[in-house]
């Protein structure tokens, strides 16, 4: 039975040009994390795995950095990179949980004066 | 060169016992995920058991669960499938096949052994 | 457990032609997907892993997409030897499920 649970950052915002850090945490459970993939809209952008440490899709080598942890930074962001992004974690014996996090990339002007939220 | 050769397959009765054997070669076995996939008469592949790199972690489908073992013995690059209370569904060709890192899925098959559960 | 529904279940179709395979799955499954090809007699082999990676060996006019829940592999310019059968195979949760599998065979 899966009792677990994800906590990420829920809603967060971040300038243009800036950098992100997107944080998930699995609790509740024993299970083993044997993988973490990110993965935004229909991409995977990064895996992280027990054994065999961070792969970063090609496509995502130059804007994306491992960790910290679990976690994933993006860089140089665009206001392109807005959207909802995903952390998959492949676990046993309870098998498959994911969280969500949006990000809203402002221009920034509009983020020094904008209100900044986060969701625990 | 990957290599994977099963071996073992046989006609046994419902409710018999029956363990097949893969040898890899050409790659290093301690290093990948391994799995046991079954075709059925009518070409339906079905996955059968899982085992990660270290043989610490198992998974396997309802149909089979509490009847199938996966194992390995990475000193002899050999993986194992003990299957025990057959049955006439259990009849196929059962392949072992290597998990590319990373991604679960399966990169290199071995050739099949078949398997024929029948009074 | 998640449920795989390919289509079609065949197709006849002739050299030269663009041919379009496609997997539904009963719930998000990310990019946790892999395309196979098996020809008669033979072994499967992987195609397409991670949804969109053509894997290595595969020739390029194979390519695997995703919108949501649906993921396609497409066959652009049919050879005679791509003729045989394609599945798709989840990886998600505990249970690593295939789908139907389509048989394309020439016209």
């Known amino acids: 039975m899966m009792t677990g649970t994800i906590e990420t950052t829920g809603n967060i915002s971040a300038e243009k040009g800036g950098s992100i850090i997107l944080q998930c945490h699995l609790s509740s459970t024993t299970a083993q994390v044997t993988q973490v993939n990110w993965e935004q809209q229909d991409q995977l952008l990064a895996i992280c795995n027990a054994d065999l440490g961070w792969h970063i899709s090609p496509s995502f080598k130059d804007r994306v950095a491992p960790g910290p942890g679990l976690g994933l930074t993006l860089q140089s962001l665009t206001v392109n990179d807005t959207g909802e992004y995903f952390c998959i974690y492949h676990t046993y014996p309870d098998g498959t949980y994911t969280g969500r996090i949006f990000l809203e990339v402002l221009e920034s002007s509009v983020a020094e004066h904008g209100a900044r939220f986060q969701i625990p | 060169e990957v290599q994977l050769v099963e071996s073992g397959g046989d006609l046994v009765k419902p409710g018999g016992s029956l363990k097949l054997s893969c040898a890899a070669s050409?790659?290093?076995?301690?290093?990948?995920?391994m799995s046991w996939v079954r075709q059925t008469p009518d070409k339906r592949l079905e996955w059968v058991a899982i085992i990660s790199s270290g043989g610490n972690y198992t998974y396997y489908p309802d149909s089979v669960k509490g009847r199938f073992t996966i194992s390995r013995d990475n000193a002899k690059n050999t993986l194992y499938l003990q299957m025990s209370s057959l049955k006439s569904e259990d009849t196929a060709m059962y392949y072992c096949a290597r998990q590319i890192h990373y991604f679960f899925a399966m990169d290199y098959w071995g050739q099949g052994t078949s398997v024929t559960v029948s009074s | 457990d998640i449920q795989m529904t390919q289509s079609p279940a065949s197709l006849s179709v002739s050299v030269g032609e663009t041919v379009t395979i496609t997997c539904r799955a009963s719930?998000?499954?990310?990019?946790?997907l892999a395309w196979y090809q098996q020809k008669q007699g033979k072994s499967p082999q992987l195609l397409v892993y991670?949804?969109?990676n053509l894997a290595d060996g595969a020739p390029s006019r194979f390519s695997g997409s995703r919108s949501g829940t649906q993921y396609s592999l497409k066959i652009n310019s049919l050879q005679s030897e791509d003729f045989g059968s394609y599945y798709c195979?989840?990886?998600?949760?505990?249970?690593?499920?295939f789908g139907g599998g389509t048989k394309l065979e020439i016209k």
């Open positions: 991670a949804a969109t």
């Open positions: 195979q989840h990886f998600w949760g505990t249970a690593y499920t």
């Open positions: 719930e998000n499954i990310y990019s946790n």
């Open positions: 050409g790659f290093t076995f301690s290093s990948y995920g």
